[in-house]
């Protein structure tokens, strides 16, 4: 019995659902009563899901798997794995037994995009040309391990004096911290690129240092120029710092975070005490770092509704403020492709191909092309609908007249994460049915 699975690994984003495709060719007169189907982990032989005696025997894998019962009779033995975790990565074997027996293994490659890097300087005040400064580039919650590259403002690679460490959290996601030590010139731009090798996703940030003494007078409040990009459901740090003078004590500090536009209070520190969160109890300061001038705000479990500008007000004897933008993002799922009509297709038929990708933010850009990379822009209709959480489901419909054969591919791009998700469908033969019977 020939069992078919994809040659390439199935790539799935952490938290999304993945389909491990497996198919066989049922003979005429085949009934599900004859079918024994077992999915198991290739290495440990742990049972994942099974179908026997005409019945779905259910998930033996954390209750996160499902078959496609309506498609089994057509030879579709694919397995749906829900809420993918890093620990799911590996090889799954699909065993099919009717009268004969066959098996094949499919690899699952798990991935998670890295956050836009945050950049910190140490020391971060009174910098002069000739000073040695440590620049730290931190990017969070990615998988697998990242590759990190540094360069200056002219694209010159900076490879000396770089130390990169990557630590996995309980979920197996990596936080990467890369440290560059440089001697300052008159001024300079330093940029850090964090690459996810599986998603081929680049996240980058840069810092420009102009060494000079801060002007006396108002408190100089520093925030990142670029928006802070945070994935929905993760935590974000809105960085804000000031330069405390010698003899500064927290009793002198008044710190207020508020929404820039509505002036709604978010969090405050006054009279030597953290006054707590006024923002859905999802914010926190870094109390141990306040005395060193770190007034950053931690925003937990980021939602789409959090997107916008936050102002950091610092008052000691003098007063200063600066606004930092929060850009919320969520990766789009791998598009699913459907055809209408989906059977007895012949050259000359008009067919509607729908490309659907789910739960991304902000709105996606959608591109269609044929198998030669030629863009298909005519007869495309794209709609994007936000759910209650503000995440978008995108549905793009392409109407084409079939040739003898053709590949149609759809690319869904998240413009903030610079993340591309794509799906394609190949229509061959005459006549044919979709999905093709294996």
């Amino acid at each position: 019995l020939e069992v078919q699975v994809p040659e390439d690994p199935v790539v799935a984003l952490v938290g999304t659902d993945a389909t491990l495709c497996c198919s066989f060719s049922p003979e005429p007169g085949f009934s599900l009563a004859q079918l024994n189907l077992i999915w198991q982990l290739t290495d440990t032989k742990q049972l994942v899901h099974s179908f026997a005696e005409g019945q779905d025997q259910g998930s033996a894998y954390a209750n996160r798997t499902a078959l496609f019962p309506d498609l089994l009779a057509q030879g579709n033995a694919s397995l749906r794995l829900q809420r993918v975790r890093v620990a799911d990565e590996g090889s799954f074997t699909c065993f099919v037994s009717i009268r004969d027996f066959g098996s094949a293994a499919v690899s699952l490659q798990v991935a998670a995009p890295y956050s836009k890097p945050s950049m910190t300087l140490e020391p971060n005040k009174d910098l002069r040309p000739g000073d040695t400064v440590t620049i730290t580039c931190s990017s969070y919650q990615g998988y697998p391990e990242a590759e990190v590259f540094w360069q200056d403002g002219q694209g010159v690679p900076l490879t000396g004096n770089v130390t990169t460490s990557q630590m996995a959290n309980e979920q197996g996601l990596f936080d990467v911290h890369s440290i560059l030590r440089v001697v300052l010139g008159a001024n300079g731009t330093y940029s850090c690129l964090v690459r996810n090798p599986v998603l081929q996703q680049d996240a980058h940030s840069s810092v420009t240092i102009t060494p000079q003494r801060s002007p006396t007078g108002a408190v100089e409040v520093q925030v990142p120029e670029d928006p802070v990009v945070a994935l929905v459901g993760t935590d974000a740090t809105l960085r804000c710092s000031f330069s405390p003078e010698p003899g500064f004590s927290l009793a002198q500090l008044n710190l207020i975070w508020q929404l820039t536009d509505t002036k709604q209070l978010v969090h405050s520190f006054t009279e030597g005490r953290d006054q707590g969160s006024a923002y859905a109890n999802r914010t926190a300061l870094f109390p141990d770092l306040l005395a060193q001038g770190n007034a950053s705000l931690r925003l937990q479990r980021v939602r789409v509704a959090d997107e916008g500008s936050f102002t950091c007000f610092v008052s000691i004897r003098d007063f200063g403020s600066a606004a930092v933008s929060l850009q919320v993002a969520a990766p789009y799922s791998k598009p699913s492709m459907t055809l209408e009509p989906n059977k007895d297709l012949r050259p000359g038929d008009t067919v509607t191909i729908t490309c659907s990708s789910y739960r991304g933010y902000p709105e996606a850009e959608v591109f269609w092309q044929d198998g030669q990379g030629v863009p298909l822009t005519g007869n495309v209709t794209t709609s994007q609908m936000a759910n209650e959480q503000g995440l978008f489901d995108v549905h793009s419909v392409l109407r084409v007249v079939l040739g003898a054969n053709g590949t149609y591919s759809c690319l869904v791009r998240n413009p903030v994460l610079q993340q591309d998700a794509h799906g394609s469908v190949t229509i061959t033969g005459q006549p044919m049915t979709f999905p093709p019977e294996a």
């Epitope: 590759e147 590259f149 360069q151 403002g153 002219q154 694209g155 010159v156 690679p157 490879t159 010139g185 008159a186 731009t189 940029s191 690129l193 690459r195 090798p197 680049d202 980058h204 840069s206």
Partner: antibody, heavy 121, light 106 residues
């Protein structure tokens, strides 16, 4: 129009030096690094080094480090590459090129027309 | 030094054919650029940052890849594409080019 115009062909004796110029026009000369790349007859491209015309920082391919000097004159928007102790294997076309782009992606978007240097006794 | 190895070194192809040139780096690079050089001409930028078409370059050219393996693809080759193609990286010193792939049109 952004252009890099190089000096004319040179014929040199082994052991001597050659200095090739590259005049930039149509853009801010100090905003981009200028690189020198050479190509021996029938061979591929070989990077020699670069200069940041603003800071005058330079870096060279170790292979040429002791023999090459790259300089720039901001007042005339001209970069120079001098190669000393010439030998026959230095016979090549020498190109200057502008390294352009923005963080973090950079590339050679403008090339000079090339200067042929022939080393022969 | 990061060594870039292109394959093939030489290819003779007929018009309308699809051509794939690969560039393998000896260690991981952040991105790859591709250049086209015709006889007695200066190199010309073709693909920047792995997959972005340079200005004025026909859409039959495309680039892809990541890490150590990169590809330049020419869909439906035309006679004017006869040239030598070079990949280039500068993720670490020195800046390096591939040895080149010469395309000849039959």
């Amino acid at each position: 129009e952004v252009q890099l115009v190089q000096s004319g062909a040179e014929v040199k004796k082994p052991g001597s030096s050659v200095k090739v110029s590259c005049k930039a026009s149509g853009y801010s000369f100090t905003s981009y690094t200028i690189h020198w790349v050479r190509q021996a007859p029938g061979q591929g491209l070989e990077w020699m080094g670069y200069i940041n015309p603003n800071s005058r920082n330079t870096d060279y391919n170790q292979k040429f480090k002791d023999r090459v000097t790259i300089t720039a004159d901001k007042s005339t928007s001209t970069a120079y590459m001098e190669l000393s102790s010439l030998r026959s294997e230095d016979t090549a076309v020498y190109y200057c090129a502008r390294y352009s782009g923005s963080t973090p992606y950079w590339y050679f978007d403008v090339w000079g027309q090339g200067t042929t240097v022939t080393v022969s006794s | 030094e990061i060594v870039l190895t292109q394959s093939p070194d030489f290819q003779s192809v007929t018009p309308k054919e699809k051509v794939t040139i690969t560039c393998r780096a000896s260690s991981s690079v952040s991105y790859m650029n591709w250049y086209q050089q015709k006889p007695d001409q200066s190199p010309k930028l073709l693909i920047k940052a792995t997959s972005n078409l340079a200005s004025g370059v026909p859409s039959r050219f495309s680039g892809s890849g990541s890490g150590t393996d990169f590809t330049l693809t020419i869909n439906s080759l035309e006679a004017e594409d006869a040239a030598t193609y070079y990949c280039q990286q500068w993720s670490s010193n020195p800046l390096t080019f591939g040895q080149g792939t010469k395309l000849e049109i039959k």
